[in-house]
């Protein structure tokens, strides 16, 4: 039976050009974590394998850094990074646990003007 739960950083709102850390934590289980995948929509960003360490997808190498821990650091954020991110914990013997984090990246002008929407 899968007893574990995933806690995440929570959803994040950030500014264009900045950086953020996405983190998940698996608790309430004694299962062994064999691998953690980080994905956005259907794209694989990075893998942290218990034996082989980190692998960052080539298309994200410039802007994605491993860690801290099993987390992932996204740098030089763009509006295109707005979206849902998944931490997928592969464990033995439990199986797979998934956490979801939504990242909102705001244009700096949007952030400065608050909730008053800007006419283009």
């Amino acid at each position: 039976m899968m007893t574990g739960t995933i806690e995440t950083t929570g959803n994040i709102s950030a500014e264009k050009g900045g950086s953020i850390i996405l983190q998940c934590h698996l608790s309430s289980t004694t299962a062994q974590v064999t691998q953690v995948n980080w994905e956005q929509q259907d794209q694989l960003l990075a893998i942290c394998n218990a034996d082989l360490g980190w692998h960052i997808s080539p298309s994200f190498k410039d802007r994605v850094a491993p860690g801290p821990g099993l987390g992932l650091t996204l740098q030089s954020l763009t509006v295109n990074d707005t979206g849902e991110y998944f931490c997928i914990y592969h464990t033995y013997p439990d199986g797979t646990y998934t956490g979801r984090i939504f990242l909102e990246v705001l244009e700096s002008s949007v952030a400065e003007h608050g909730a008053r929407f800007q006419i283009p």
Epitope: G10, I12, V79, F102, E104, V110, G114, I119
Partner: antibody, heavy 118, light 112 residues
């Protein structure tokens, strides 16, 4: 002036699908996520999901995955929600709402009433 | 999913009253950066919901200062200092910190 103009009321038969449109004007369409909200029985509000008009990326409430499909047409600043395999449980008022995490759902469409009945 | 509990469900008032609506979440709404995405909405009959407060305590553009928001962690409050006729309707809180976003069940502000 910011406006979200939704398509009109719909009466559809069980098992059918339908698409609601939400045309945005008065602000930068790609700068804010577009959210969709269901109101059943004139009371409960439920978040269906959102779409990032900039890149078409979506995030769904798992409850509505397979029921709702969100898309956008950037050229016309219009967001769409298609509802599939309709049942009486889908009869509700559906709203589009522009905004996001930090600033809330700042602007709302007028709502589209969907009635599913044979 | 994060459960958002709103109390009371019904609030009978007289014009000029000061009232408070409570919103409690099943887990903390502060993310790892200390930001809390909690907003309040008023839904009047025959209209669309309207944003009153975002980020716990920030009044949206054009919202009168008789509306104020406060709270942290799991407990949040919307205060209306002097009830006016246009304030009657359903009030909802919305948490945006955890997926999926969830609304409270609503508080109906109605005349005594």
């Amino acid at each position: 002036e910011v406006q979200l103009q939704q398509s009109g009321p719909e009466l559809v038969k069980p098992g059918a699908s339908m698409k609601i449109s939400c045309k945005a004007s008065g602000y930068s369409f790609t700068g804010y996520t577009m959210n969709w909200v269901k109101q059943s029985h004139g009371k409960n509000l439920e978040w269906i999901g959102l779409i990032n008009p900039y890149n078409g990326g979506t995030s769904y409430n798992q409850k509505f995955k397979g029921k709702a499909t969100l898309t956008v047409d950037k050229s016309s600043s219009t967001a769409y929600m298609e509802l599939l395999s309709l049942t009486s449980e889908d009869s509700a008022v559906y709203y589009c709402a522009s905004g996001g995490l930090r600033y809330g759902f700042a602007y709302w469409g007028q709502g589209t009433t969907l009635t599913v009945s044979s | 999913d994060v459960v958002v509990t709103q109390t009371p469900l019904s609030l009978p008032v007289s014009f000029g009253d000061q009232v408070s609506i409570s919103c409690r979440s099943s887990q903390s709404l502060a993310n790892s950066y200390g930001n809390t995405y909690l907003s309040w909405y008023l839904h009047k009959p025959g209209q669309s919901p309207q944003l009153l407060i975002y980020g716990i305590s920030n009044r949206f553009s054009g919202v009168p200062d008789r509306f104020s928001g406060s709270g942290s962690g799991t407990d949040f409050t919307l205060k209306i200092s002097t009830i006016k006729p246009e304030d009657l309707g359903m009030y909802y809180c919305l948490q945006g910190t955890h997926q999926p976003l969830t609304f409270g069940a609503g508080t109906k502000l109605e005349l005594k």
